[in-house]
């Protein structure tokens, strides 16, 4: 069955920095979405070889692509605190196939030590169930942030 390899699992970056998310498949795609998860999932990009990519207005002017739809690296620039979240690749084939997710933690420079990624993939959270015609890795991607120290305030 088709799979999407997504990396990294998690990354911590300061405000204003960039992050690379790579979505790799064995080919045979119609295209690929990068979606920010949450109660109201938000498409960030849709990329299809030979077609002008669609980019959400929030990220317009700060997204770059390299590679092809089968092995796509998406670079998000000038990250803001509000960009913190879990991003998942959705490959469109004859079914929907999902990556394992990338948890992006955007921190103010002085608070970087408070929130850092563990080695584990993003942990499962209250995500919508995938469509029935979909292939989704188990466990599902996570959108939960690591627990901060009691004294800290998350943005």
């Amino acid at each position: 069955a088709q799979e999407v390899q997504q990396s990294p699992h998690c990354t911590t970056v300061p405000v204003g920095a960039s992050v690379n998310i790579t979505c790799s498949t064995s080919g045979g795609l119609r295209g690929i979405y990068l979606r920010q998860l949450g109660p109201q999932p938000q498409d960030i990009i849709y990329y299809e070889d030979g077609v002008v990519p669609t980019t959400d207005r929030r990220f317009r002017g700060r997204i770059d692509f390299s590679g092809s739809q089968d092995n796509l690296t998406i670079t998000m620039h000038r990250l803001q605190l509000s960009d913190t979240g879990t991003y998942t690749c959705q490959a469109i084939t004859e079914v929907n196939v999902y990556g394992s997710g990338t948890l992006v933690l955007v921190t103010e420079e002085q608070s970087q030590g408070w929130h850092r990624c563990s080695d584990a993939p993003p942990r499962a959270s209250a995500l919508p169930a995938p469509p029935t015609g979909s292939a989704l890795p188990d466990p599902q991607t996570a959108s939960a942030l690591p627990d901060p120290p009691a004294a800290s305030a998350l943005p």
Epitope: R30, G31, Y33, R35, Q36, P39, Q40, P41, Q42, D43, I44, Y46, T54, D56, I92, T93, E94, V95, N96, P128, A129, P130, P131, T132, G133, S134
Partner: antibody, heavy 117, light 107 residues
């Protein structure tokens, strides 16, 4: 059981506006792309618009700039705002669950929009 | 846009007959083809997706085949409840486009 129920159709004059709604039940609405397809009286099917689960929107050239598709995941609802309506927009409008970017596996019962002076 | 040409536009066959409907795309669609059935006065229903996959609950007398630009829907043994209009639809590229339909009647 997955159910889609359209509403909001009716008679409108050319140049007028109408907002169609589609209430979904029996599915995790936020996980699915959704589409509108129309069928003019005695004619075939025509795709109108789609919205991905993450909110990207796509339109047929015939409605681009006049129609707006939107969704409210909290209300399990899909919408089609139709402006500057023309006689040729007269049709039954169906909402459909878009299982895999174009594979429309569940359809509502349809709502009739008539544009006439 | 990808044009979908369906033929015949209508046909009349006897109960038990094998019925074949064809759909031709103006460019290759990589098997991203669906077939829908619409009975008179009713809502379209998905029959076959991705060229040959039978949608749940669809009788096994329906089958689909094809590749590239040419696709076929076959009803192996026509039944009274198969009286309907059948539409093909490509979903390889936006905009999604439908064939003009084939009306199937019983002789």
């Amino acid at each position: 059981e997955v159910q889609l129920v359209e509403s909001g159709g009716g008679l409108v004059k050319p140049g007028g506006s109408l907002r169609l709604s589609c209430a979904a039940s029996g599915l995790t609405f936020s996980s699915y792309a959704m589409s509108w397809v129309r069928q003019a009286p005695g004619k075939g099917l025509e795709w109108v618009a789609s919205i991905s689960s993450g909110g990207f929107t796509y339109y047929a050239d015939s409605v681009k700039g006049r129609f707006t598709i939107s969704r409210d995941n909290a209300k399990n609802s899909l919408y089609l705002q139709m402006n500057s309506l023309r006689a040729e927009d007269t049709a039954v409008y169906y909402c459909a669950r878009d299982e895999v970017r174009g594979y429309l596996d569940v359809w509502g019962q349809g709502t009739l929009v008539t544009v006439s002076s | 846009d990808i044009q979908m040409t369906q033929s015949p536009s209508s046909l009349s066959a006897s109960l038990g007959d094998r019925v074949t409907i064809t759909c031709s795309a103006s460019q290759g669609i990589s098997n991203y083809l669906n077939w829908y059935q619409q009975k008179p006065g009713k809502v379209p229903k998905l029959l076959i997706y991705y060229t040959s996959s039978l949608h749940s609950g669809v009788p096994s007398r329906f089958s689909g085949s094809g590749s590239g630009t040419d696709y076929t829907l076959t009803i192996s043994s026509l039944q009274p409840e198969d009286v309907a209009t059948y539409y093909c639809q490509q979903y390889s590229k936006l905009p999604y486009t439908f064939g003009g339909g084939t009306k199937v009647e019983i002789k």
